[in-house]
């Protein structure tokens, strides 16, 4: 289950309106749901950005967001929210979603540079994308929601636009 916009634990908290919010906004007076990409930190008494803790060992509250963020950083992969998995575009080029358009169209234009899995796929082999051993470098407390995403090359603005669209 996604930790986005949900409390990591129960409880209610008063918010002092006159203070500057760590997120620049307060979101009501009882325990609240937070905007996308934030989570409720009851000890701090406010919504906090998930981005700050994605590299920290404790990302239970933002597990889905952090997996998605790490996945987006890796060229040629995208995060599928339904599957809750980091998908290799190379494994689905040809019937790819728009998130892979940039990767697949570029790769198809230059077959010399195709990765082995795509070369196999084009010659009729099917890649088993479930084996992602050694690819994850995230939380030591990730539990059952561990992601195969590996922080890697940053996406360009155009690529990010595709990922976020």
């Amino acid at each position: 289950m996604s930790g986005l916009g949900r409390s990591r634990r129960g409880g209610r908290s008063r918010v002092d309106q006159e203070e500057r919010s760590p997120q620049g906004l307060w979101t009501g007076v009882a325990m609240r749901s937070c905007p996308e990409e934030q989570y409720w930190d009851p000890l701090l008494g406010t919504c906090m950005s998930c981005k700050a803790i994605c590299n920290h060992q404790s990302q239970r509250t933002c597990a889905t967001f952090c997996r998605s963020l790490n996945c987006r950083k890796e060229q040629g992969r995208f995060y599928d929210h339904l599957l809750r998995d980091c998908i290799s575009c190379a494994s689905i080029c040809g019937q790819h979603p728009k998130q892979c358009a940039y990767f697949c169209e570029n790769k198809l234009r230059s077959p010399v540079n195709l990765p082995p899995e795509l070369r196999r796929q084009r010659s009729g082999e099917v890649e088993n994308n479930s084996d992602n051993s050694g690819r994850y470098q995230g939380s030591e407390h990730r539990g059952s929601e561990a992601s195969p995403a590996l922080p890697g090359l940053k996406l360009s603005a155009d690529q990010l636009a595709l990922v976020y669209s």
Partner: antibody, heavy 118, light 107 residues
Framework: QVQLVQSGAEVKKPGASVKVSCKAS????????MHWVKQKPGQGLEWMGY????????KYAQKFQGKVTMTSDKSTSTVYMELSSLTSEDTAVYYC???????????WGQGTLVTVSS | DIQMTQSPSSLSASVGDRVTITCRAS??????LSWYQQKPGKAPKLLMR???RLHSGVPSRFSGSGSGTDFTLTISSLEQEDFATYYC?????????FGGGTKVEIK
């Protein structure tokens, strides 16, 4: 390794202000919340408030509203805690402490003794 | 605010003794209970987070247990460097609050 180094002891007169610094190293400064904790001589620990250096967001304990102001300087990875209108009640050791995102304060500065005396 | 009550406020023990300190929260704090050790003139040091997880570098003779409102810190065999004051702290609800401390002295 993570280190929080605070400024030295201060002696102030009643009514004055004091600004204590806490310089962080060994981690990404903007990724963690910094808290301040007060300890009067021979007494326990009292939470004062926190600052998120990422965007200078702050939140203070009700007791310290109007008394404390927390700021940060990203260029030097330093947070500051300023106390105004000092009285003898403000005589204490002040600690900065990093929040570990799981409800604990995992690293602490060495403390700064502020003495208010006429 | 959540009140944290530690007991005893002080205790005398000898090297090698098993020592138990308790902390009670005024309301349910799940497992978000931390323990700190403080020596005179020094800053507190995190010993235990989330009730029973030892902080890096903390000896295994320290252990924690409990859930909800009642928690304990146990030192299985007291060593000379363990004579100090111990504080519990709840991390479940704003604002964070500390127990009054337990001073462990040499008998």
């Amino acid at each position: 390794q993570v280190q929080l180094v605070q400024s030295g002891a201060e002696v102030k007169k009643p009514g004055a202000s004091v600004k204590v610094s806490c310089k962080a190293s060994g981690y990404t400064f903007t990724n963690y919340v910094m808290h301040w904790v007060k300890q009067k001589p021979g007494q326990g620990l009292e939470w004062m408030g926190y600052i998120l250096p990422y965007n200078d967001g702050t939140k203070y304990a009700q007791k310290f509203q109007g008394k404390v102001t927390m700021t940060s300087d990203k260029s030097t990875s330093t947070v500051y805690m300023e106390l105004s209108s000092l009285t003898s009640e403000d005589t204490a050791v002040y600690y900065c402490a990093r929040y570990d995102w799981e409800g604990s304060f995992d690293y602490w500065g060495q403390g700064t003794l502020v003495t208010v005396s006429s | 605010d959540i009140q944290m009550t530690q007991s005893p406020s002080s205790l005398s023990a000898s090297v090698g003794d098993r020592v138990t300190i308790t902390c009670r929260a005024s309301q349910d704090i799940s497992n978000y209970l931390s323990w700190y050790q403080q020596k005179p003139g020094k800053a507190p040091k995190l010993l235990m987070r989330y009730t029973s997880r030892l902080h890096s570098g903390v000896p295994s003779r320290f252990s924690g247990s409990g859930s909800g409102t009642d928690f304990t810190l146990t030192i299985s065999s007291l060593e000379q460097e363990d004579f100090a004051t111990y504080y519990c702290q709840q991390g479940n609800l704003f604002p964070p609050t500390f127990g009054g401390g337990t001073k462990v002295e040499i008998k």
